[in-house]
Interface confidence: low
């Protein structure tokens, strides 16, 4: 089920080229593994990738460039991640999700 | 299996310079960060510095922060440690550390599965 | 930057429970990793994350954390679990490592 991630919408506008940071608010104890989706106007939402606090490493999904994306963080707290090389086609509504069980 | 051997270790005078090197093989050199992590005589672990699988990133502790200078040559398979206005207090074992998660991992990250043997320096006059 | 602080020496007898902490501000925020080092040997991974250990490690160890704690427990302590102890974690400019904690076996 999904759990204990604090939702906080905000805008981000970047200029192309530039990058931009978002943060998802952890629970305290919300721990596995931690999806990063994006969700543009008339697609389905698509995963880009997910973080696995058990060992704070990231796995892209297919197709995911690497260096395009960059999550760090604590595995207790927050985590953030980094977009690079902006390009119009980056607009869209970002999400992070969890679930446990 | 994996395996870190250090080298270039030994006597130096206080103000004196030296360069670390540890070979690297049993994995793939360019998909993890690194770490130089020391230990003096008789005391504990301190961290050093620590470089990005990539090498476009690299951190230092505040002790040797603008003294030393952590590097890496991919083709070689070698992690370096520039080392440059050595004090007495730089006395200790430098070991070599395989950061435990690979390319996803900001060099920071501090889960270390690997060290090396370490290679002893000792800055005295 | 952060420090981690660590009781400098426990003991335990064998076969019971002992609990080494290791309390800093950046565990706050981030989970520690624990690396045990036997006299004349290089230090070992012994739990990291969560609740992991590498491969070969026993699950006699585990970890828990609460607040800017630490904890790693060794539940039925044996001979070969005698060793310094050390807790690390991120730093405000890369890693910290806790100043370790002696464990004797009795």
């Known amino acids: 089920k999904s759990s204990n991630l604090e939702g906080r919408t905000k805008s981000v506008i970047r200029q192309t080229g530039s990058s931009a940071e978002i943060t998802c608010d952890l629970a305290e104890g919300s721990t596995g593994y931690i999806h990063w989706y994006l969700h543009q106007e008339g697609k389905a939402p698509q995963r880009l990738l997910y973080y696995d606090s058990y060992t704070s490493s990231v796995v892209l999904e297919s197709g995911i460039s690497p260096g395009k994306y960059d999550t760090y963080g604590s595995t207790r707290k927050n985590l953030r991640m980094i977009l690079r090389n902006l390009i119009e086609n980056d607009s869209g509504v970002y999400y992070c999700a969890t679930w446990d069980g | 299996q994996v395996q870190l051997v250090e080298s270039g270790g030994g006597l130096v005078q206080p103000g004196g310079s030296l360069r670390l090197s540890c070979a690297a093989s049993?994995?793939?050199?360019?998909?993890?960060?690194m770490h130089w992590v020391r230990q003096a005589p008789g005391k504990g672990l301190e961290w050093v510095s620590g470089?990005?699988?990539?090498?476009?990133?690299?951190n230092y502790a505040g002790s040797v922060k603008g003294r030393f200078t952590v590097s890496r040559d991919t083709s070689k398979n070698t992690l370096y440690l520039q080392m440059n206005s050595l004090r007495a207090e730089d006395t200790a074992v430098y070991y070599c550390v395989k950061s435990y998660v690979d390319t996803a991992m900001r060099y920071y990250y501090y889960y270390m599965d690997v060290w090396g043997q370490g290679t002893m320096v000792t800055v005295s006059s | 930057s952060y420090e981690l602080t660590q009781d400098p020496a426990v003991s335990v007898a064998l076969g019971q429970t002992v609990t080494i902490t290791c309390q800093g501000d950046?565990?706050?925020?981030?989970?520690a990793s624990w690396y045990r080092q036997k006299p004349g040997q290089t230090p070992v991974l012994v739990v990291y994350g969560k609740n992991n250990r590498p491969s070969g490690i026993p699950d006699r160890f585990s970890v828990s954390a609460s607040g800017n704690t630490a904890s790693l427990t060794i539940t039925g302590a044996q001979a070969e679990d005698e060793g310094d102890y050390y807790c690390?974690?991120?730093?405000?400019?890369?890693?910290?490592f806790g100043g370790g904690t002696k464990v004797t076996v009795l």
């Open positions: 470089i990005s699988a990539g090498g476009g990133s690299t």
């Open positions: 049993g994995f793939t050199f360019d998909d993890y960060a």
């Open positions: 950046s565990l706050r925020n981030y989970y």
């Open positions: 690390n974690s991120r730093d405000s400019s890369g890693v910290v």
